[in-house]
Amino acid sequence: EYSNCGENEYYNQTTGLCQECPPCGPGEEPYLSCGYGTKDEDYGCVPCPAEKFSKGGYQICRRHKDCEGFFRATVLTPGDMENDAECGPCLPGYYMLENRPRNIYGMVCYSCLLAPPNTKECVGATSGASANFPGTSGSSTLSPFQHAHKELSGQGHLATA
């Protein structure tokens, strides 16, 4: 029965059972709906656009970390369709609060203008530190059903087949 199927399952008329929605591969996200018993006949997977990535499954494409703009850190590895960007040491003129509890954004670099005296990254010149920037990988998986209605990905498909 349709109502018994889970978030990522559709009802297979042939077998009379709930079946897993086909997952997307890395670098892709679901397009159209599949889940809670129903599956669009043209349900499929579309590639992540530039500046976004996905690990596959039912995950929508998410924006790469903005190392320089948001974290004020260097780019260790630029992101691609399948991987998030990895941030490196702080940019010159910025330092990292080592023992501060991490928030959802991971470790953020702060301006040396606000640094306590003798902060090693800020002593002398405003040169960057060599402290490594830990990567963050917050997972925010939405079902294809939610994705199809919210259009969070910005793919903007219209009647794609």
Partner: antibody
Framework: EVPLEESGGGLVKPGGSRKLSCAAS????????MHWVRQAPEKGLEWVAY????????YYADTVKGRFTISRDNAKSTLFLQMTSLRSEDTAMYYC????????????WGAGTTVTVSS | DIQMTQSTSSLSASLGDRVTISCRAS??????LNWYQQRPDGTVKLLIY???RSQSGVPSRFSGSGSGTDYSLTISNLEQEDVATYFC?????????FGGGTKLEIK
């Protein structure tokens, strides 16, 4: 074995009709969406029509809307294109092409059948 | 409709050359770009899908890249059997559209 084989092409007078067929083999036809794509002489490729695996979704190019009808018979693993009110600009090689499962491109193409509209 | 433009309609290169064929979309197609090879006998074959992914069985000398509106197909070590016309195709939105094609010949 050729997975997709078109037939039904030939010479037709302007205003006439023609029905093209595409016989599929070597794969489960009912699992796949199918397209028709055409190519006028010395021109590029032009998408014509699409039908989903169970025929619930059908789309046409504006140039053929109202004149062409795409259909399929899953029991016989065959795709069709009924063409009416044919014009000289419909003269082309017509290819049937398979939509890859879960993807939005053509992964297998037939060899094509030629339709010539001329008086 | 999304217009696909292949600015070079024909090009000639020598065996072993590295050849790049470009394609531009009239709007962002979010990497939903595919490349097809049409041999002189009319046979059409998928080479690259979703910008950079090689279709099974396609020689590794074929590669694709790009993003947004600009995409390219590269043949790294041109062989005689690569003589064909190459078409780009956007699968982002119906109606699907193709570039005008780039005919590749051997010098």
């Amino acid at each position: 074995e050729v997975p997709l084989e078109e037939s039904g092409g030939g010479l037709v007078k302007p205003g006439g009709s023609r029905k093209l067929s595409c016989a599929a083999s070597g794969f489960t036809f009912s699992d796949y969406g199918m397209h028709w794509v055409r190519q006028a002489p010395e021109k590029g490729l032009e998408w014509v029509a699409y039908i989903s695996s169970g025929s619930s979704a059908i789309y046409y190019a504006d140039t053929v809307k109202g004149r062409f009808t795409i259909s399929r018979d899953n029991a016989k693993s065959t795709l069709f294109l009924q063409m009416t009110s044919l014009r000289s600009e419909d003269t082309a090689m017509y290819y049937c092409a398979r939509r890859e499962i879960l993807r939005y491109y053509f992964d297998v193409w037939g060899a094509g059948t030629t339709v010539t509209v001329s008086s | 409709d999304i217009q696909m433009t292949q600015s070079t309609s024909s090009l000639s290169a020598s065996l072993g050359d590295r050849v790049t064929i470009s394609c531009r979309a009239s709007q962002d197609i979010s990497n939903n770009l595919n490349w097809y090879q049409q041999r002189p006998d009319g046979t059409v074959k998928l080479l690259i899908y979703y910008t950079s992914r090689s279709q099974s069985g396609v020689p590794s000398r074929f590669s694709g890249s790009g993003s947004g509106t600009d995409y390219s197909l590269t043949i790294s070590n041109l062989e005689q059997e690569d003589v064909a016309t190459y078409f780009c195709h956007q699968g982002k939105t119906l109606p699907y559209t193709f570039g005008g094609g780039t005919k590749l010949e051997i010098k």
